[in-house]
Interface confidence: low
């Protein structure tokens, strides 16, 4: 399918102008290649009418132009002084006319309505409000005022000053007669329907002296705004419906093949399961406007979307709506990355998050999607070091591997960590992506002691066992802080008995702190990686105590606990409104976890190269 996208149908009236916008993937080649607007003939050939290279056909001379916007990946065709001869089938495209990089556009130019002289034209979107003004002379001031709708040759009474209201307009129309001296009455119609479209007649008085005024009411369906986004990327629908519906339930729905509209999400808590984990309805502002963010775009997300307001949280005739036509470009600049990452209880995951490589300096964030009600995504970690307190010691955001990808590591996994997480930056919002973490059956590959108590001034050796499959990986120990995990010197040791299946290939990497200082207290991670790509990690908490005990201190793998002592962290997921997703800088004033002290100095974190067999009898 062609990646070029534009409006399928354009309609206008004789004498008017149209502006047609076409989208294309903004690759270097596409930005500079020829853009064209051509008309399809009976033979199937498409005759160029206007192109980006300056060509304009004779019947478009002086009334059409084509402007390319390479930075946006769009070009716009403007056509003025339309005639009915302009009705027909067209293509907007790139390159040569016969190639497939194009989009079909149907243009329909109709004859303008022949309106009586002095007719006032009111053009209003469906669901909105219109105020029809009806002037009258002084002698008709005390007489009956009325509004009629012309249907064919007859006039149907809509409302009058004697309290009559046509049932079709019940509860949404009112007639206002001003005080003395003002020779004008008004009729206000709310929640306009398409069926309200037509010619109206204001009347004051009766007989030959009556005052009459014609009003042509054109109720328009909102023109869908074209939205062109990349596969796997993100789209934001901004919906501003007006103050009059500020306190009414809001929704976003997608038009289906039956031309009804299926709710995607609404403020009453309904959400389409196809968007689980990848949609947020941002809280509305005082003016009633709101936005819906969808990440992880799929080709099947394409279509026509409507946002609106109604107490039922779904589309109803006569209520204001806004419309979008979403096109998902399969020639995506957003790289493929796993949408599901699996980890085992007690183990870890390393999530790769894409970002726009042109924005390497942007702040990077990771948040946890909460599905209840409208959805929200409290931030857990950011590249400047903020970490939610209950993730202390087990979550880190790394700038590596860089060049369009950052890494988030989460360890000490529990079943409660299962869920959807979003990668985002404070830059290009279209690069937000979603990843689902699933907790599966299994054992962590890296084995470290559960909890360690070190003694001030003495030597501490912490072992980390890894299986043979990691023998080719780079192994490391690092000290965790809320700004990252600083790598410390460590060494692979001899064979370990921790893994029975491949004991000669099993390995041990150990960290030695000598001498132990107060600053050494905190979380340490043992991990494996290949270049800048991180694999599994395991965490151990080191407590430092005053008590003096003779001799060096070694944590025996045989006696090490299976997992660290759990502690209740003084923390909770940040409950921050989704507005912050649009501008993560809003988080800047939030409290961060205090740094856990100086990093252990390289000179004190030294190597212990003896094998585990030699030290098997050491006490913990």
């Amino acid at each position: 399918k062609s990646p070029v996208f534009g409006p399928q149908e354009v309609s206008s009236v004789e004498g008017n102008s149209v502006s047609i916008k076409c989208y294309y993937p903004p690759t270097s080649v596409n930005r500079h290649t020829r853009k064209y607007w051509c008309r399809k003939g009976a033979s199937g050939r498409c005759i160029t009418l206007v192109s980006s290279e300056g060509y304009v056909s004779s019947n478009y001379a002086g009334r059409a132009n084509l402007t390319n916007f390479p930075e946006n990946g769009t070009f716009v065709v403007n056509i003025a002084q339309l005639s009915r001869d302009d009705s027909g089938h067209y293509k907007c495209g790139l390159g040569i006319n016969s190639r497939g990089l194009s989009f079909d556009v149907s243009l329909e130019v109709s004859q303008g309505p022949e309106l009586p002289n002095g007719t006032e034209v009111y053009t209003v979107d469906v669901g909105r409000t219109v105020t029809i003004k009806c002037p009258f002379k002084t002698e008709n001031a005390p007489k009956t005022k009325a509004l009629y709708k012309k249907i064919g040759q007859t006039s149907v009474l809509v409302i009058d000053s004697r309290n009559y209201v046509n049932p079709n307009y019940k509860d949404r129309i009112r007639l206002r007669i001003p005080g003395t001296g003002q020779l004008i009455f008004t009729v206000v119609i709310d929640r306009l329907r398409l069926s309200d479209h037509g010619l109206y007649l204001c009347q004051a008085g009766d007989g030959s002296n009556r005052d009459e005024k014609n009003a042509d009411l054109q109720v328009l369906e909102p023109e869908p705004e074209l939205v062109y986004e990349d596969l796997r990327g993100s789209v934001t629908f901004h919906c501003a419906l007006g103050l009059e519906v500020a306190n009414v339930a809001k929704f976003l729905c997608r038009v289906n093949s039956r031309e009804t509209c299926d709710v995607v999400i609404n403020t009453l808590g309904k959400r389409d399961s196809a968007f689980e984990g990848r949609i947020l309805l941002n809280p509305q502002d005082k003016d009633g406007s709101f936005s819906v963010v969808i990440t992880g775009l799929r080709k099947e997300d394409e279509g026509r979307y409507l946002c609106g307001a109604h107490s039922d949280g779904q589309l109803q005739e006569g209520w204001p709506i806004q419309a979008w036509q979403l096109f998902v470009n399969e020639e995506s600049t957003i790289p493929r990355s796993p949408t599901v990452v699996k980890g085992v209880a007690g183990g870890s995951v390393a999530v790769l998050c894409p970002y726009n490589p042109k924005e390497s300096q942007s702040l990077k964030y990771w948040c946890l999607w909460e599905g209840a009600q409208n959805g929200r995504c409290p931030l857990l970690v950011e590249s400047q070091g903020l970490v939610q307190e209950q993730y202390e010691g087990r979550l880190s955001l790394l700038q590596e591997p860089g060049n369009g990808t950052f890494t988030v590591i989460l360890n000490q996994l529990t079943t409660q960590d299962a869920g959807f997480y979003w990668c985002l930056t404070n830059g290009d919002t279209r690069w937000r992506t979603t990843v689902e973490i699933k907790i599966i059956e299994g054992e962590p590959n890296l084995k470290v002691p559960g909890n360690v108590t070190a003694v001030l001034g003495e030597t501490l050796n912490i072992p980390c066992h890894f299986p043979c499959k990691f023998s080719s990986y780079e192994k490391y120990w690092c000290k965790w802080s809320n700004t990252g995990c600083q790598t410390l010197p460590s060494q692979d040791e001899g064979p370990s008995e921790a893994f029975v299946n491949c004991d000669e290939n099993s390995r041990l990497v150990s960290l030695t702190l000598n001498p132990v200082t107060r600053a050494d207290e905190g979380w340490y991670w043992c991990g494996v990686k290949q270049g800048h790509f991180y694999g599994e990690t395991a965490a151990v908490y080191v407590a430092v105590e005053e008590k003096k005990v003779a001799g060096s201190r070694y944590v025996s793998p045989a006696k090490a606990d299976a997992a660290p002592d759990e502690k209740v962290l003084d923390s909770g997921v940040r409950e921050i409104e989704n507005k912050a997703i649009q501008d993560p800088r809003l988080f800047a004033e939030e409290k961060v976890v205090a740094d856990t002290g100086d990093q252990a100095g390289g000179s004190r974190a030294s190597v212990d190269s003896s094998s585990s067999e030699e030290q098997g009898g050491s006490s913990k």
Epitope: L368, E370, G371, A372, Q373, G375, R376, P378, Q388, E389, Q390, Q416, G419, V568, L569, D570, S571, G572, V573, R574, E575, I576, E577, E590, K591
Partner: nanobody, 124 residues
Framework: QVQLVESGGGLVQTGGSLRLSCAAS????????MGWFRQAPGKEREFVAA????????WYADSVKGRFTISRDNAKTMVYLQMNGLKPEDTAVYYC?????????????????WGQGTLVTVSS
């Protein structure tokens, strides 16, 4: 103004169950983390459990993990604490509290409004 009213406390035997309820009013209930704390005679107020705005995140003190369950009903503006396997050391006045939404779910300082409390007594 914000009002939190606890109910459901009482006398129960060791191993028994109770369900505490907290009715909230005067706030946009669905925007806040809510928590339960308790205070035994002569002791400091301590964290028991908390639940996030949307209910997707919950936190528990180690001493109640696996026995207590916190839940909420945003439509009814209610928060609940289901207490099973009660022990004599669970005896205390239990308080419902509204979070400040400053990111700390388990600290007393993270809450700005408190109920009057409901007494739970577990006899051996």
């Amino acid at each position: 103004q914000v009002q939190l009213v606890e109910s459901g406390g009482g006398l129960v035997q060791t191993g028994g169950s109770l369900r505490l309820s907290c009715a909230a009013s005067g706030l946009t209930f669905s925007s806040y983390t809510m928590g339960w704390f308790r205070q035994a005679p002569g002791k400091e107020r301590e964290f028991v459990a908390a639940i996030s705005w949307g209910g997707a995140s919950t936190w528990y003190a180690d001493s109640v993990k696996g026995r207590f369950t916190i839940s909420r009903d945003n439509a009814k503006t209610m928060v609940y604490l289901q207490m099973n396997g009660l022990k004599p050391e669970d005896t205390a006045v239990y308080y419902c509290a509204k979070g400040r939404n400053n990111g700390y779910a388990t600290a007393v300082r993270a809450y700005d409004y408190w109920g009057q409390g409901t007494l739970v007594t577990v006899s051996s």
